[in-house]
Interface confidence: low
């Protein structure tokens, strides 16, 4: 018996087609992805093949103005239109709190939404009961397939799930649910979830009875043969893991941003054992036409976005200096504003020992592309912010050793004075440079804001300590020459859309007046 699994993950609000790098579509003839194009390909496969499941492994939320405006209603509407069979909850589904998940998505979705390792308690337990499930048994042709969901246990540090959801260890939570499916005589089981490729592989290895793992969170691109676009494969598709009980378990992911549709064919024997698995992600490029009815619907929903981008988010009563003459040479107040917004967006009161789990931000000055003039009545709009942060990136959470941070700050000024983009703006950091010293030895003082303290204060950076830092995904991926970050990071979790982070902060503050306050000094 053969099953075709179509899968997406980490779509992050890319409802419209995008450029090859998943940013805003500029040249339509070269654009990719989007739900209208996805629908065309899915329908084509559904017509051609008998047993097809369309699954999503989480993080539909967050990433473009679509989410900022529609707050998840767009996800439910278009996933319903594509007739998804199931979705696993990702960490970003909690970005607007539990209410922001329940109302627009859980209550509106016509497909099951899954997670076995999220347990509700207190008053939320009855409110959310039945709106998401640990597993779902789906009829496919003459057979049944069990889908068990899972979500990153790090979600409380990555999003805003509140205090009434407990995120358990994935493997511990999945095993009893899989065992339950076995007692129900379900012998074909897919684990669908959002914890990253390393956890996906562990699930494949450790959870008895899981036949296939469909994952997300790490934006992993797997491919067998010559890849069709710029993404470099992390391994073959499917990636095969041998379980502790000796079975070959295929593990798949489909990169991110709706650029690819994962396509996996599984052959099961009569006992539900995987006999063979093969496939590849399908690049959703312009050779696949956009479905006209879905495209028309997208255009209808788009109107509200255009109106939103010119509305006032808040006011500034000072000039927001985002000029390259400032931000690539010295502390600039636009850099301070953005870093403060980045930290504010990551406030999660971890426990009594820590006022927050992260206190530091770094931001390449070259990523700040425009100032905002306060003389326009002080008005700040989404359009203004899109000029400051035009690349459609995310502000991510990483863990780095102090020694890596020291290298990053040396790199920040290794060729100072040439208006290059690697000069770092900061938050929760005090750095002093001596430019008379040779490159690689110019950082003379580097103090960082404590997190394990009731009154935050600055302490010298410790080389062997592990620190959490918020930074643009561009830096996490080694951009602007920050190869040491890419090579030495100990953990990397993708965060929220950059403009959204800053716009939310400005809306929250209402009036802003960021200063230059001595975060970066020269001796």
């Amino acid at each position: 018996w053969e099953l075709t699994i179509l899968h997406t993950n980490d779509v992050h609000s890319r409802l419209e087609q995008t450029s090859e790098d998943s940013s805003k579509c500029v040249n339509a003839s070269r654009c990719m992805g989007g739900v209208a194009r996805l629908f065309t390909k899915v329908q084509q496969i559904r017509r051609a093949e008998p047993n097809v499941l369309l699954l999503d492994a989480g993080d539909q939320y967050q990433g473009t103005i679509w989410f900022t405006v529609y707050k998840g209603a767009e996800v439910a509407h278009f996933m319903n239109a594509l007739r998804y069979d199931a979705m696993a909850l990702g960490n970003h589904e909690f970005d607007n709190g539990v209410e922001g998940l329940i109302e627009p998505l859980l209550k509106e979705a016509k497909f099951p939404i899954l997670s076995a390792n999220i347990k509700a308690k207190g008053p939320l337990a009855s409110q959310i009961s039945g709106l998401y499930l640990p597993y779902k048994v789906l009829p496919v042709g003459d057979e049944v397939v069990g889908i068990v969901g899972y979500t990153s246990k790090e979600t409380p540090f990555l999003s805003n799930p509140g205090t009434n959801l407990v995120f358990e260890d994935e493997i511990t939570a999945l095993q009893p649910e899989v065992d339950k499916l076995k007692t129900l005589n379900v012998n074909k089981i897919i684990a669908l979830g959002h914890s990253g490729f390393e956890t996906d592989k562990l699930i494949a290895q450790k959870v008895r009875g899981v036949d296939v793992v469909v994952g997300g969170h790490s934006n992993t691109f797997l491919y067998t043969g010559n890849p069709p676009s710029k993404e470099v494969p992390a391994g073959k598709y499917p990636f095969i893991v041998t379980s502790d009980d000796g079975r070959k378990v295929p593990v798949v992911q489909a990169y991110a941003f709706g650029k690819y549709l994962g396509y996996l064919k599984i052959e099961f024997d009569e006992r539900g054992n995987v006999i063979s698995s093969h496939g590849n992600p399908i690049l959703l490029n312009s050779s696949i036409p956009e479905d006209p009815s879905i495209k028309a619907d997208i255009n209808k929903w788009r109107i509200k976005l255009d109106n939103y981008s010119t509305q006032e988010l808040g006011k500034t009563i000072v000039y927001l200096d985002g000029s390259s003459q400032s931000c690539r040479f010295r502390e600039c107040n636009m850099g301070n504003l953005i870093c403060d917004a980045m930290i504010n967006n990551n406030l999660r009161h971890a426990d009594e020992m820590f006022w927050n789990h992260v206190s530091m931000c770094i931001l390449n000055g070259g990523g700040i592309r425009s100032p905002i003039d306060e003389r326009n009545n002080g008005t700040i709009t989404w359009e203004n912010l899109a000029a400051v942060l035009p690349f459609g990136g995310t502000f991510d959470l990483v863990q780095l050793k102090g020694s890596t941070l020291k290298k990053a700050f040396e790199h920040s000024v290794h060729r100072y004075g040439q208006s290059t983009g690697e000069f770092l703006q900061v938050g929760g950091i005090h750095v002093v440079y001596d430019l008379s010293r040779k490159p690689g030895d110019r950082v003379v003082k580097l103090d960082v804001l404590c997190t394990k303290c009731r009154v935050p204060s600055y302490d010298p950076l410790k080389m062997d300590e592990i620190y959490k830092v918020i930074l643009p995904n561009f830096l996490a991926n080694g951009g602007d020459g920050f190869q040491m970050i890419k090579d030495e990071l100990l953990r990397h979790d993708s965060g929220d859309q950059d403009i959204n982070v800053v716009s939310t902060y400005i809306s929250k503050m209402k009036v802003i007046y960021p200063a230059v306050e001595g975060r970066i000094k020269f001796s």
Partner: antibody, heavy 117, light 107 residues
Framework: DIQLQESGPGLVKPSQSLSLTCSVT?????????WNWIRQFPGNKLEWMGY???????NYNPSLKNRISITRDTSKNQFFLKLNSVTPEDTATYYC??????????WGQGTLVTVSA | DIQMTQSPASLSASVGETVTITCRAS??????LAWYQQKQGKSLQLLVD???NLGEGVPSRFSGSGSGTQFYLKINSLQPEDFGVYYC?????????FGGGTKLELK
């Protein structure tokens, strides 16, 4: 072509530790697959001892769990067997082999280890 | 642990004959079974995996069959180079275990 080669002392005293090395050429042990130790006793009985995976996880035969350790040196593309508190019953030919989701397709030529005072 | 029982323990046959070796698993191992050949002083060579798939370069006179708990290795028209010891092994779950071996000798 993939080749595996065992090396180590041929004679070990009782109560001491047995240490063997498997050197792999033609394939990186961090790429994929599981890297196993198997032994064959006099009289031909075969026993799977354990493996180390491409991503540095272990799985041991429960009959040896308290005595066995399999580690690796990725820079040398080698993996190692350490068996503690040996007795004459541990006298055997020790093989390293590449397995994984498949059976053992590639084997070393084997090395005889005698445990004797 | 899953026990693998091979029979017969030894077998004498002549060149050109057909022989069958049986392997029984103490529990269901589906098709996760391999057959190996070992010549004197050499390491094992994979003949069959997944109970029935011939390994690369293995002559077509060898064939594997069975699933669940009962498996067979058949050698048609024995050749001089076929004499040695044959082992079955399951890889359904750890610990992987081997059969006790079948010694195939020249009659």
């Amino acid at each position: 072509d993939i080749q595996l080669q065992e090396s180590g002392p041929g004679l070990v005293k009782p109560s001491q530790s047995l240490s063997l090395t498997c050197s792999v050429t033609g394939y990186s042990i961090t790429s994929r697959y599981y890297w196993n130790w198997i032994r064959q006793f006099p009289g031909n009985k075969l026993e799977w001892m354990g493996y180390i995976t491409y991503d540095d996880n272990n799985n041991y035969n429960p009959s040896l769990k308290n005595r066995i350790s399999i580690t690796r040196d990725t820079s040398k593309n080698q993996f190692f067997l350490k068996l503690n508190s040996v007795t004459p019953e541990d006298t055997a030919t020790y093989y390293c082999a590449r397995g994984g989701w498949d059976p053992f397709l590639y084997w070393g030529q084997g090395t005889l280890v005698t445990v004797s005072a | 642990d899953i026990q693998m029982t091979q029979s017969p323990a030894s077998l004498s046959a002549s060149v050109g004959e057909t022989v069958t070796i049986t392997c029984r698993a103490s529990d269901n191992i589906y098709s996760y079974l391999a057959w190996y050949q070992q010549k004197q002083g050499k390491s094992l060579q994979l003949l069959v995996d997944s109970a029935k798939n011939l390994g690369e370069g293995v002559p077509s006179r060898f064939s594997g069959s069975g699933s669940g708990t009962q498996f067979y290795l058949k050698i048609n028209s024995l050749q001089p180079e076929d004499f040695g010891v044959y082992y079955c092994q399951h890889y359904y779950g750890t610990p992987f275990t081997f059969g006790g071996g079948t010694k195939l000798e020249l009659k």
